[in-house]
Interface confidence: medium
């Protein structure tokens, strides 16, 4: 299969190998993402499904608006002219690149041989987490946990899905008199995809005076959602390998296949309730999430603020 | 509260044309799909047509393929179904329904009105 | 297309009784049917959406399964309010294909 990353909002064609550029086509397209339950089969003259990816012409799938919510599997079949049935299969990954991080609270000056915090080091608006890396005079930084120590912390904005990440760098310098420069960069870790780095900070190291948490998120935001609305449920772990991810509503568990995304679609006041995450992992046991609430309820005119990342409408079509 | 009216029905002779209107309320109307269904006198449900939330993508059965026309207004909360080259068959109660959000499904239903195809 | 075959097409029942409805699908249309209760003179009202969920303000003696492409609609104690039309609908793919129907009559 073919490894297929994708800017989220951005549209997305895939090629079905082998199928004729023009009708007659002998072909299939089926996806398996977080919008579907199990693999759900496209029909080539389009339907209910057209919002979500739709057939073109040329066999083609076409993604309007990329979501997180539609990282999966993608699969096509199709008989070529010579009646040979050849096989298309795409991993699809979604990606956002965020704003240039920046070095919040950073420090005038350190002192030899004492902890020292040299600043903060911050990036907004990432998907999906990507890392954070500190360096010294122009080298990596790798935390030893004694003279280099980094505090790590990881958000998700319960709307968007995109991260802000926060990297804080406590060191002890051995020595007066040196004048180091720090800087911090942003890696999403795709291939051919730069880092991002702040601007660097040199800071003067003087000689020592007297001694002086799982995440569950929620979209739409706060899990008020109309009837017939769309609610989309992401558990947020940053451990590798990606553990498994059960479901519990209101203290009982789902019998749902496990996913760290679920997906409500055409909610009614069966679906209230509270929801929450359980993932388990080989090393560490089960943890689960704080809980959410689910509220169904007609919101009126001012607007629903249900759907997820990349659900607006197509463009015309011919 | 959800409120859908239709309008717009009435006697038509064979191969003449009509417009059905159907007005929401209740709702934010551009984030649903909207559909129409009919339901000849003493018959089952039938699809007419069902447009998504941006207008952008119509569907229809053969049955009304090239003869209706689905559309709507979403600064005015409206919906639409043009029919021409009516026929005896088109005689119906004609729904308007709201779907879901992202999937083309039925929710909401107005009260009908009535189309009748003579001469 | 796919087609819903729909049955009994009507059925005789007391209040009280347990009544099953099922809708087979031509094709595997996964938990994406809706079920609706229509009354003479009336519009259709939604009582199942997804196969299995209640929809708003359904009583709770009305209830939907699936198993594979069969979708059932039970009536655990019939009422005398239940006496209707009851129609099951694929929404998984175009053309949106309701059942045939089936006519709840008092016994």
């Known amino acids: 299969g073919q490894n297929i990353t994708a800017r989220i909002g951005e549209p997305l064609v895939l090629s079905c190998k082998g199928a004729p550029k023009k009708p007659p086509q002998q072909l299939e397209w089926k996806l398996n993402t977080g919008r579907t339950e199990a693999w759900k089969v496209l029909s080539p003259q389009g339907g209910p499904w057209d919002s979500v990816a739709r057939i073109l012409p040329n066999g083609s799938l076409l993604l309007p608006a990329t979501g997180i919510v539609d990282e999966g599997t993608f699969r096509c079949r199709a008989t070529n002219r010579r009646g040979k049935e050849v096989k298309s299969n795409y991993r699809v990954r979604v990606y956002q690149i965020p704003g240039k991080p920046e070095i919040v609270d950073p420090a005038s000056e350190l002192t030899a041989s004492v902890p020292n915090k040299v600043g903060t080091c911050v990036s907004e608006g990432s998907y999906p987490a990507g890392t954070l890396s500190w360096h010294l005079d122009g080298k990596l930084l790798i935390p030893d946990g004694k003279e280099t120590l980094v505090k790590e912390e990881t958000r998700r904005h319960p709307e968007t899905g995109l991260f802000t990440l926060r990297s804080e760098l406590t060191v002890i310098p051995t020595q007066g008199g040196t004048h180091p420069t720090f800087s911090c960069s942003f890696s999403l870790g795709l291939p051919r995809r730069r880092p991002l780095n702040t601007a660097p900070i040199q800071l003067r190291v003087r000689e020592p005076g007297p001694p002086e948490g799982i995440q569950l998120l929620v979209e739409p935001e706060g899990g008020i959602v109309a009837p017939g609305g769309t609610v989309t449920l992401t558990c947020a772990i940053s451990a590798q390998p990606p553990p498994q991810v059960h479901w519990i509503k209101d203290g009982a568990p789902l019998p749902l296949a496990p996913s760290p995304v679920l997906l409500l679609p055409e909610v009614g006041h069966e679906d209230e309730g509270t929801y929450s995450c359980v993932a388990t992992h080989p090393s560490h046991g089960p943890q689960e999430s704080p809980p959410v609430s689910i509220r169904v309820t007609e919101t009126g005119d001012e607007g629903p603020a249900e759907g997820s990342v990349g659900e607006s409408g197509l463009g015309t079509l011919a | 509260e959800v409120q859908l009216v239709e309008s717009g029905g009435g006697l038509v002779q064979p191969g003449g044309s009509l417009r059905l209107s159907c007005a929401a309320s209740?709702?934010?109307?551009?984030?649903?799909?909207m559909t129409w269904v009919r339901q000849a006198p003493g018959k089952g449900l039938e699809w007419v047509a069902s447009?998504?939330?941006?207008?952008?993508?119509?569907y229809y059965p053969d049955s009304v393929k090239d003869r209706f026309t689905i559309s709507r207004d979403n600064a005015k909360n409206s919906l639409y179904l043009q029919m021409n080259s009516l026929r005896a068959e088109d005689t119906a109660v004609y729904y308007c329904a709201r779907g879901g959000d992202i999937l083309d499904s039925l929710h909401f239903w107005g009260q009908g009105t009535l189309v009748t195809v003579s001469s | 297309d796919i087609q819903m075959t729909q049955s009994p097409s009507s059925l005789s029942a007391s209040v009280g009784d347990r009544v099953t409805i099922t809708c087979r699908a031509s094709?595997?249309?996964?938990?994406?049917v809706n079920w609706f209760q229509q009354k003479p003179g009336k519009a259709p009202r939604r009582l199942i959406y997804r196969a299995t969920n209640l929809a708003d303000g359904v009583p709770s003696r009305f209830s939907g399964s699936r198993s594979g492409t069969d979708f059932t609609l039970t009536i655990s104690s019939l009422q005398p309010e239940d006496f209707a039309t009851y129609y099951c609908l694929e929404f998984d793919e175009h053309p949106l294909t309701f059942g045939g129907g089936t006519k709840v009559e008092i016994k």
């Open positions: 094709q595997d249309v996964g938990i994406y």
């Open positions: 447009i998504d939330n941006s207008g952008d993508n119509t």
């Open positions: 209740g709702f934010t109307f551009n984030n649903y799909w």
